[in-house]
Interface confidence: low
């Protein structure tokens, strides 16, 4: 299913974070929280779907705790009073590790998926349409929070694209929060009129099913590889591309290509067999000189989830992995609007693509 009319993502918001959910929660809304659990401080973090910013009315409190072997608390707070806890005595998060946390709002419940796997269902205790705010606090660093509204009419192909009906600023500025932590470049508030989120839904109401026999659907967000899609309007300064996924346990390599016709304007190629992140450009089937330097160790890890944020600027692409700036790549193909195709392939599972 394609998603459109979604609000722009919050990129690398500082924690604690509170942000508006434009239009409130709706049946079918999917909210993805991508980040990394901090390894140093604290034993808890929480994602709250709430009314307003006070924290007195929380429809869904999702609270992983690295205590007593690890467990996750789910609860609801009404008029400042907590209800009975629901505990899941399994911890799908790891300290120091990135995660992809997806909330699907449905008529009867929230479905929560962690790194592509259904983790818990939380049945509504209060009407979800009252929720207009998402907040995140605790020992976590955020890469992004994105919003995906299902179309009222299902269409194919799944990555059909529809522009926003209203221009939006990208990213919207979180209310009353401090600036981003060092290491992540500042947001560019230039207006963007088209943002497309490419997601996979197996079938209406069956997003997370994993039948024992080969099903006739994609059981949870898993993109066929290679994943290829158009970048509406091509690249331009301030244009962002977001991808998240999981590296396969036996991965050798994967690639993210930004293409212009038959040329690969930007080839991002993490190689686990060489412990390198190779960048290059291919013009008329000829590769240029590779760039491999990194400011820190290889950020991609076999078996671990990741997020990649590519920000186009006038002279270069800036690439951040798991919310941390990794490198700049100066444009070799400078006709940016013609760079209008994204190709992803190799030994990864994609869970989220936003162009």
């Amino acid at each position: 299913m394609a998603f459109s009319g979604s609000q722009a993502p919050y990129l690398s918001p500082a924690v604690p974070f509170s942000g508006t959910i434009q239009g409130g929660l709706q049946d079918g809304l999917q909210i993805t929280v991508n980040g990394t659990v901090l390894s140093s401080s604290g034993t808890r973090f929480a994602v709250n779907f709430q009314t307003g910013f006070s924290g007195n009315d929380i429809a869904f409190h999702f609270n992983p705790r690295f205590e007593d072997g690890g467990y996750v608390v789910c609860n609801t707070r009404q008029n400042g009073s907590w209800g009975p806890e629901e505990r899941k005595t399994h911890m799908p998060f790891q300290k120091g590790m990135p995660f992809d946390l997806c909330f699907l709002v449905q008529s009867s419940d929230f479905k929560v998926m962690v790194n592509g796997i259904l983790f818990v269902q939380y049945f509504h205790r209060v009407p979800f349409h009252r929720v207009d705010t998402i907040s995140v606090n605790g020992s976590v660093q955020l890469s992004y929070i994105s919003f995906q509204n299902p179309r009222t009419v299902p269409v194919q192909p799944a990555f059909s694209t529809v522009p926003f009906s209203q221009p939006v600023c990208f990213p919207p500025r979180p209310r009353g929060r401090r600036q981003k932590p060092p290491g992540v470049w500042p947001a560019n508030p230039a207006p963007i009129t088209q943002t497309v989120i490419h997601t996979v839904q197996s079938a209406p109401g069956q997003m997370f099913s994993t039948p024992a026999i080969p099903p006739m659907m994609y059981p949870h967000p898993a993109y066929p590889m290679p994943f290829i899609t158009t970048i509406l309007g091509g690249l331009y300064p301030s244009k962002s591309i977001l991808l998240s996924g999981t590296v396969l346990p036996s991965a050798q390599r994967f690639h993210i290509n930004l293409c212009s016709g038959n040329h690969i304007a930007f080839h991002l190629n993490p190689r686990f067999d060489e412990n390198a992140v190779v960048r290059n450009t291919q013009i008329d089937n000829s590769w240029g000189s590779e760039e491999r330097s990194l400011p820190r160790k290889m950020p991609f890890v076999r078996g671990q989830s990741f997020s990649v944020w590519i920000l186009c600027e006038a002279h270069c692409l800036k690439v951040a992995v798991d919310g941390q700036h990794l490198f700049e790549y100066y444009h070799r193909l400078r006709n940016l609007p013609t760079i209008n195709r994204l190709e992803v392939g190799g030994d990864i599972q994609l869970t989220h693509v936003q162009t």
Partner: antibody, heavy 129, light 108 residues
Framework: EVQLVESGGGLVQPGGSLRLSCAAS????????IHWVRQAPGKGLEWVAS????????YYADSVKGRFTISADTSKNTAYLQMNSLRAEDTAVYYC??????????????????????WGQGTLVTVSS | DIQMTQSPSSLSASVGDRVTITCRAS??????VAWYQQKPGKAPKLLIY???SLYSGVPSRFSGSRSGTDFTLTISSLQPEDFATYYC??????????FGQGTKVEIK
């Protein structure tokens, strides 16, 4: 029971066109990957084209790119291979096959791969003057 | 494109023999390799996927393994119904998909 039945093969002159059909039953083409593979007489297997209907994604071997088009009619649960500008070297038995659904119970990574678990019986295409 | 070099092109063996067929990829293909069996006039049948996973319903005498860019199909004890042609296939980075040239297993 999963079944794939090809049809549409036959004798055609060089430069001519043919449309092969692959009628599927026992599964839904919309949510699967369908692949065409050919085998020239006495030769090995050659992958031709693939489609993931759900995503509108199509892929082609270099040898047929620009001449062949893979498509699917989900209402008929049928995939097609439209073959134009046919050449003598396109003579082969054409098989349609379904990609294997690889369920990653441990990794959580499940996908339709190009490992082909169900095949049709094949249809012969002869390009000759 | 990634090439799959299959060897031997043919072999003669007896019932009960252990048979090994190898495919070497021209570059790393991770574990994205499958093996098929084809009998004359019939469509191929999937035996192994992801280099070493036995496809449902395939006898356990068939096995697959990987060492770097070398992939091996082993038939631990050849049965009369196993005389056929075997193909390897790779899909690393998924497209283009390529097959090995085939190995014909004949009766000695």
């Amino acid at each position: 029971e999963v079944q794939l039945v090809e049809s549409g093969g036959g004798l055609v002159q060089p430069g001519g066109s043919l449309r092969l059909s692959c009628a599927a039953s026992g599964f839904t083409v919309s949510y699967s990957s369908i692949h065409w593979v050919r085998q020239a007489p006495g030769k090995g297997l050659e992958w031709v084209a693939s489609i993931y209907s759900y995503y509108g994604s199509t892929y082609y071997a270099d040898s047929v790119k620009g001449r062949f088009t893979i498509s699917a009619d989900t209402s008929k649960n049928t995939a097609y291979l439209q073959m134009n500008s046919l050449r003598a070297e396109d003579t082969a038995v054409y098989y349609c096959a379904r990609g294997h659904y690889q369920e990653g119970r441990k990794s959580g990574f499940s996908y339709w791969s190009p490992a082909l678990d169900y095949w049709g019986q094949g249809t012969l295409v002869t390009v000759s003057s | 494109d990634i090439q799959m070099t299959q060897s031997p092109s043919s072999l003669s063996a007896s019932v009960g023999d252990r048979v090994t067929i190898t495919c070497r990829a021209s570059q790393s293909v991770s574990s994205a390799v499958a093996w098929y069996q084809q009998k004359p006039g019939k469509a191929p049948k999937l035996l192994i996927y992801s280099a070493s996973s036995l496809y449902s319903g395939v006898p356990s005498r068939f096995s697959g393994s990987r060492s770097g860019t070398d992939f091996t199909l082993t038939i631990s004890s050849l049965q009369p119904e196993d005389f056929a042609t075997y193909y390897c296939q790779q899909w690393y980075w998924y497209y283009p998909v390529t097959f090995g040239q085939g190995t014909k297993v004949e009766i000695k």
